[in-house]
Amino acid sequence: QNASRGRRQRRMHPNVSQGCQGGCATCSDYNGCLSCKPRLFFALERIGMKQIGVCLSSCPSGYYGTRYPDINKCTKCKADCDTCFNKNFCTKCKSGFYLHLGKCLDNCPEGLEANNHTMECVSIVHCEVSEWNPWSPCTKKGKTCGFKRGTETRVREIIQHPSAKGNLCPPTNETRKCTVQRKKCQKGERGKKGRERKRKKPNKGESKEAIPDSKSLESSKEIPEQRENKQQQKKRKVQDKQKSVSVSTVH
């Protein structure tokens, strides 16, 4: 069969080769493959200014294989498509286009957004958060004793991060002021901070609320940290007025 095809081609192409290479059924020196062996795909390959026929077992990027009875070829994907399954179903779009249901689009349809990483149109994903966790214990400077007013915090987790066009996440941290029943700190609760404060002046900006007022000292044993002269207490009151208590919410 191949021989007879070769003879015929010689009439149209004086340079038909006797032995075709690379899956060609018929070929010529000038045009390369003219036809292919069964199951192979004919394709045009550009070599310099010239296009020659080649026979391939699979088609190159930008082409898909079309099979007709006893004749197969590589057929170009649409102009905006890089890789396709067939003429009407693209699997990867060229730069600047977004893939949606096998088509390449300039812009994604309503209700979808462009994913610039995958270059696909994807559903808009809104933020989802869990229920709030319980409030934390009321604390002041990390301590749960030795003060009247402090702050408590609660948190919730992000279950689903939003996509670019999705609704932003609501705050995941919430802080509020709280009041506790005054209780004295036990020995073990004071820690290193307390022992250091005995030997040095208090830090600037330290809140008055961290220590009980003078009335409370009457009903409780004095402990070293609470011994302050009146001058120091006056100084602390001025500092407290200058420092306003702010509660921030983290997004």
């Epitope: 069969q1 191949n2 007879s4 095809r5 003879r7 015929r8 081609q9 149209m12 192409h13 059924a25 018929t26 070929c27 010529s28 045009n31 390369g32 493959c33 003219l34 036809s35 292919c36 004919f42 045009l44 296009q51 026929g53 079309t66 007709y68 009875p69 006893d70 004749i71 070829k73 057929t75 170009k76 649409k78 102009a79 003429k87």
Partner: antibody, heavy 119, light 107 residues
Framework: EVQLVESGPGLVKPSETLSLTCTVS????????WNWIRQPPGKGLEWIGY???????YQNPSLKSRVTISRDTSKNQFSLKLSSVTAADTAVYYC?????????????WGQGTLVTVSS | DIQMTQSPSSLSASVGDRVTITCKAS??????LSWFQQKPGKAPKTLIY???RLVDGVPSRFSGSGSGTDYTLTISSLQPEDFATYYC?????????FGQGTKVEIK
């Protein structure tokens, strides 16, 4: 030189089946692709379908339900049957061949035969 | 199916003129295009295949060019025997479709 000659009745009644044969010389129909093409009077060319070197066929979807292409390798002939004809099927019918995507398409043609559909 | 739009449908020219006929495909046909010449009462004759390859025996005054969807047949210097109807054919996929033809007449 490859030669193709069409033969068959020149007149067919409406609703009947048109039957044509193409006899090939100078080559074997067990290689290449053997086609039927038609041309209504004063109009353009329309491709009907082909039969391949192995006997597989492919028809133009616009005519597929009415077209049958077959062959007789012992006589080196291939045939066209077009059923349920109407006046719109009046045309010159050509057989032609090609050998693959890299060579000339329809390098060889028959001389054509006019088929008129009329009662 | 791929549609082939050929233009002009007819043209008048003189011997020695340069004639250009165009064929536009409804989608990229990747150079799988042939040109045919047909004279009255005769079968078409293949002139060019794969856009620009001349069939053996066809005069070099005939040339083809183009890519994508737009293709051209040029006759550089029209000869008396060139007055005929010209058709383009795409064979990028099946079904194959021809252009509607361009009749080249004597001016």
């Amino acid at each position: 030189e490859v030669q193709l000659v069409e033969s068959g009745p020149g007149l067919v009644k409406p609703s009947e089946t048109l039957s044509l044969t193409c006899t090939v010389s100078g080559d074997s129909i067990t290689s290449g692709y053997w086609n039927w093409i038609r041309q209504p009077p004063g109009k353009g060319l329309e491709w009907i379908g082909y039969i391949s070197y192995s006997g597989k066929t492919y028809q133009n979807p616009s005519l597929k339900s009415r077209v049958t292409i077959s062959r007789d390798t012992s006589k080196n002939q291939f045939s066209l049957k077009l059923s349920s004809v109407t006046a719109a099927d009046t045309a010159v019918y050509y057989c032609a061949t090609y050998y693959g995507y890299g060579g000339p398409w329809f390098a060889y043609w028959g001389q054509g035969t006019l088929v008129t559909v009329s009662s | 199916d791929i549609q082939m739009t050929q233009s002009p449908s007819s043209l008048s020219a003189s011997v020695g003129d340069r004639v250009t006929i165009t064929c536009k495909a409804s989608q990229d046909i990747d150079s799988y295009l042939s040109w045919f010449q047909q004279k009255p009462g005769k079968a078409p004759k293949t002139l060019i295949y794969l856009t620009n390859r001349l069939v053996d025996g066809v005069p070099s005054r005939f040339s083809g060019s183009g890519s994508g969807t737009d293709y051209t047949l040029t006759i550089s210097s029209l000869q008396p025997e060139d007055f005929a109807t010209y058709y383009c054919l795409h064979y990028d996929e099946f079904p194959l479709t021809f252009g509607q033809g361009t009749k080249v007449e004597i001016k």
